[in-house]
Interface confidence: low
């Protein structure tokens, strides 16, 4: 006997018990593929979620996060609280980035400043909580005849030879590197992983009506202790 259910299009379900009739999905449900034997319940965007795309008979609703939160996970399965630039989200809320780290976004964790000396470069612009350092030219770029894509070095004062400039640049780079290393070595930067505000897709809601009776949410926090920024 031919399986007539395979002829049922998306947006319907195949009712085996009624001579395999293709019936439309009930309200607040969908089937995204043909031949389904039942329709899936629609996702409801409640709580910290807002609707980006309404549910239709052939596709599930799509959610975004309300203002002050951003999406995480596949299909925006969770919402995480926004912080300001220069901050990261910890167990205790938004905290300023520790010295030597920065975050230029409203999400994510503080990242260490770039270590210019690892590339043989010098620090042209100091880093802040919101911005990474800007690396300047390497000492080799300061010697005559060298070509570089980095910004040109400031005009030299008359009377100073390239050798002296090279020596000063090298010394300052080493000193900066040592300072940077010491700061990182002795600062206690225990960065918490993200505090995720998990909002599960739907607790119990109406399969037939479009309103939801209650929101289900679960807040899970990292177990590790919160670190400070003391030196």
């Amino acid at each position: 006997l031919q399986d007539l259910c395979s002829n049922c299009p998306a947006g319907t379900f195949c009712d085996n018990n009624r001579s395999q009739i293709c019936s439309p999905c009930p309200p607040n449900s969908f089937s995204s593929a043909g031949g389904q034997r039942t329709c899936d319940i629609c996702r409801q965007c409640k709580g910290v979620f807002k609707t980006r795309k309404e549910c239709s008979s052939t596709s599930n609703a799509e959610c975004d996060c309300i203002s002050g939160y951003h999406c995480l996970g596949a299909e925006c399965s969770m919402c995480e609280q926004d912080c300001k630039q220069g901050q990261e989200l910890t167990k205790k809320g938004c905290k300023d980035c520790c010295f030597g780290t920065f975050n230029d976004q409203k999400r994510g964790i503080c990242r260490p400043w770039t270590n210019c000396s690892l590339d043989g470069k010098s620090v042209l612009v100091n880093g802040t909580k919101e911005r990474d350092v800007v690396c300047g030219p390497s000492p080799a770029d300061l010697s005559p005849g060298a070509s570089s894509a980095t910004p040109p070095a400031p005009a030299r004062e008359p009377g100073h030879s390239p050798q002296i400039i090279f020596f000063l640049a090298l010394t300052s780079t080493v000193v900066l590197f040592l300072l940077f290393f010491l700061v990182l070595r002795f600062s206690v930067v225990k960065r918490s992983r993200k505090k995720l505000l998990y909002i599960f897709k739907q607790p119990f809601m109406r399969p037939v009506q479009t309103t939801q009776e209650e929101d289900g949410c679960s807040c899970r926090f990292p177990e590790e202790e919160e670190g400070g920024c003391e030196l």
């Epitope: 034997r37 039942t38 319940i41 739907q202 037939v208």
Partner: antibody, heavy 117, light 107 residues
């Protein structure tokens, strides 16, 4: 022929977690939902929760904090986990296939769970 | 949650009798109601879905009616194999809830 078969531990101690599996044969979990129902001795049926073809779940609001329903489509198995058991959770546990406009057209035979120390 | 109330909780009837079981919902559920039969050995079977649609393989002596909040399961001529407990179940709103059951015996 579609069949659902529950398998569970039988006896569980209070405060422990119950784990029951429903094995489905002759039917695809990507086309049908599976609902869990329990029946305490001498009492009526109580719906626990459902897992839909797409994998999303709904739980009985009174038990939501203790329940987890998941599935493995490749093994045709649906599992129910219930934590923090008490004597009140002693019951016959059934799984049933959800089809059409959400009726349970095929039921398992049920598995008896006794919560006792 | 929607409360489902069945009456009577038990009844005894003679073979060939017409039997009716009532089910009442605490709020309107349109026609989103199913009926199930649980035999003494614990086996559960679907009888009727969407208030009045007979499930495949169910004898025609079973029928269902009603709408909104009041529903009825009718057995037109009671047979020995009908000894069981009957449950109504709404699916208008999750959580899907069952009535308390009606135990049917033969006199």
């Amino acid at each position: 022929q579609v069949q659902l078969q529950e398998s569970g531990p039988g006896l569980v101690k209070p405060s422990e977690t119950l784990s029951i599996t429903c094995t489905v044969s002759g039917s695809s979990l990507t086309s049908y939902g599976v609902h869990w129902v329990r029946q305490p001795p001498g009492k009526g049926l109580e719906g626990l929760g459902v897992i839909w073809p797409g994998g999303s779940t709904n739980y009985n609001s009174a038990l939501m904090s203790r329940l987890t329903i998941s599935k493995d489509n490749s093994k045709s198995q649906v599992s129910l986990k219930m934590s923090s058991l008490t004597a009140a959770d002693t019951a016959m546990y059934y799984c049933a296939r959800v089809t059409g406009t959400w009726y349970f057209d095929v039921w398992g035979q049920g598995t008896t769970v006794t919560v006792s120390s | 949650d929607i409360q489902m109330t069945q009456s009577p909780s038990s009844l005894s009837a003679s073979l060939g009798d017409r039997v009716t079981i009532s089910c009442s919902a605490s709020q309107g559920i349109s026609n989103y109601l199913n009926w199930y039969q649980q035999k003494p050995d614990g086996t559960v079977k679907l009888l009727i879905y969407y208030t009045s649609t007979l499930h495949s393989g169910v004898p025609s002596r079973f029928s269902g009616s009603g709408s909104g909040t009041d529903f009825t399961l009718t057995i037109s001529s009671l047979q020995p194999e009908d000894v069981a407990t009957y449950y109504c179940q709404q699916y208008s709103k999750l959580p899907w809830t069952f009535g308390g059951g009606t135990k049917l015996e033969i006199k």
